[in-house]
Structures are given as C-alpha cells and as structure tokens.
Amino acid sequence: EVEKTACPSGKKAPEIDESLIFYKKWELEACVDAALLATQMDRVNAIPFTYEQLDVLKHKLDELYPQGYPESVIQHLGYLFLKMSPEDIRKWNVTSLETLKALLEVNKGHEMSPQVATLIDRFVKGRGQLDKDTLDTLTAFYPGYLCSLSPEELSSVPPSSIWAVRPQDLDTCDPRQLDVLYPKARLAFQNMNGSEYFVKIQSFLGGAPTEDLKALSQQNVSMDLATFMKLRTDAVLPLTVAEVQKLLGPHVEGLKAEERHRPVRDWILRQRQDDLDTLGLGLQGGIPNGYLVLDLSMQEALS
C-alpha cells in the first residue's frame, strides 16, 4: 500500500505520458489523477512502466472503481490486465467481443493464465451460450478450447457455432466429446451439397453412427484412412465389405496396413472371409466359409 502524500509543486500530471516513468511510486500515487488515468488507459501500454509502477496505477483504478472497472477501462488495460487477480475480474461485466480479444492478445502464445481463465468463464456465462463469434475468437487464441469442455458443457453449444470450428480445434477431443459435437455438426451443415458437406463434417465423424456412415458410402466421398481409423468401432462393425469399399474408394488399399488396429481389426472379425477376399488385399481373420454368423456384440468383452 502506497502512503498518501501531497504531490510536489509542478509535478501534477496533466496527461498520461512518458515523463511519468521517472516518477517514484509515491509521486505516481500523489500526482496522477485516477479519473485522468481511466480516460487515458490506452496510453499506458505505450509507456515502459516498471511492474512496481503498474501496481500503483492498478491501485488508483481500484480506488476509483471499487465495484469493478467499467468496460471502457477494461478494453484498454493491456499489460495491466496481467496485474489483475481472478477476484478483480469476477467484479467485471465484459460484454464486448472486442474487449475479450484485446485482453486475450496480452496472453497470446502462452498457456492460459488464471486471469484469462476467469475472464473467459465470466464472458461465456454472461453471453449465456458459446455463440459462433465467441467460439471463433477463443479457438483462434486457444485451439484446444473446445476439447477442454466436458460433454455436458458441449451439449449447450448451439449448432450454429459449429461453423467456427476448424479441424485442428478437434485434435485433442476424445470420442465422447465427438459424440456430442457430431449431431450438432450434422445439423449445421445439413444444407450443403455432398462433397462440400463431407469436407465440413469429416473432422466430426468420430461421433457418427452406423447409419450415417452407410449414407456417406453412397456418396463417393473417398474417406481417407486417418479419418476411418478415428471412427467409432461400434459404428464401423455393422458395415459390409461393399460399404467400406465405397466409403474409402481408392483409399481402401490402406486397410491392409491397418488390419491389426482398431476399428479395422474388429471389423475384419465380423466379415465373411469370402467377402474380404473380394477386396484382393490379403486381409485375413474373417469368418470362414460355411460358418453360421452369430451376433458378435460380445466380441469386445471376450477379447
């Protein structure tokens, strides 16, 4: 806490400028008017204040706004934002996306700070849902943001927001998260034509059910093996050899290299060997000719 001392004659700051970097902490406290600071916050970032001096400036704003800073001040905090505590930020009411962007920029390229984490939570809660523009902004700074939400939290994401999602934003999502996101993506992209639809939906297919994979197999999509390997095993198992062949198109040859890996391995076990042989890939492990095909849903439990 800086002691209250009178400002020396002639040192009263008429504006926020570079001359203030030569002020001692007590002089800043005594000679800088808090209201002036609030209206000229945008200048603070251009001045190389020390951390100690920034502490004084923060203290002045805290005194001026004990209930929390107004958004006009928050938007121009810049590096002073890093001096804020999560408790400070919980007092704020940030509604502008521009304010959010300005503050995220301060922390850009670094792991999420406690300040940023609190800010984002406050902002999203204030909006009521994760709308497209907010998601667009958050994933631009934090590509893994979507995958850091629980399936329950993802369920409140409106389908319209899915348009903001890029393939790399889903890189770290687990299958349960994709289970929630896929139906939203399907709804969001439903009016697109076949090839455009596949480009958009491809990243979400880890949550697709069998019937949707069957439908895709009729559309000449030529799914690559990397995408196929991320499909739900339970969704792949009921597909016929002909359907997988149509789904993969020219990429079907890649099945041989993946025959020991899920879901290909489990799918092979469900197919008649005769049908697998029609692919001409030398896939082995199918049901021998003449054997009765029973429901193999217990296969997983027995393996």
Epitope: E111, A117, G144, S150, P151, E152, D171, T172
Partner: nanobody, 115 residues
Amino acid sequence: QVQLVESGGGLVQAGGSLRLSCAASGSTFGRIVMRWYRQAQGKQREWVASIYDSGSTSYSDPVQGRFTISRDNARNTVYLQMNSLRPADTAVYYCNLGTALSSYWGQGTQVTVSS
C-alpha cells in the same frame, strides 16, 4: 512447462486389479482435461478414459464398468482404477493432460495381464 509421471503399472493375473497414478507438475490454469490412453504392442494408441474440469468422466466401451478415473486436485494427481483385468488390457498406459492450448503426455507405464 507441465510434466506428467505415471506409476502403478505391473504384472497382474486376469481378473485382478491395478491402480495407476499420474502426477502432474508445473502450472496450468483454466480448463484441464486429464485422459488415459493405452497402446498395445504393434497397435495404435487408443483412448481409455477422461475426467473433465467439471469432474464428470467418460470411458471407452471396452473398459466401461471395469475402470474408474478419478483425481485428487490437492495432489495434482489423476488415477485409473482398473478392475476385472483381461489379457486384452495388456498395454503401455499413458496419461495425457489437455489444456485449451496444449496437450502434454507422460512416458507411460506398462500393464501386463497374464491368463
């Protein structure tokens, strides 16, 4: 920088139990998802279970009902309780910490289930 260290792996008879631990060091803030993956010899790495920032959990079909993921925030540790183990559970088990920006991996711990 975040570091993850797994422990608790070993050799166990089919039907037995093991408890894996993953201790995280380094500072992370914001939402964190802790996940377990496993990789059997010559196979691809596969997801096993997740525990989200909210505390909710999810599991892959092969382990549902047998494995339980939990965490101790005070100790910065996540656990995987594995019951009714099967030979098919034999693999190197990896701990993963996912933040909104990065994904961190441990070195893995070997679990071998003999019949």
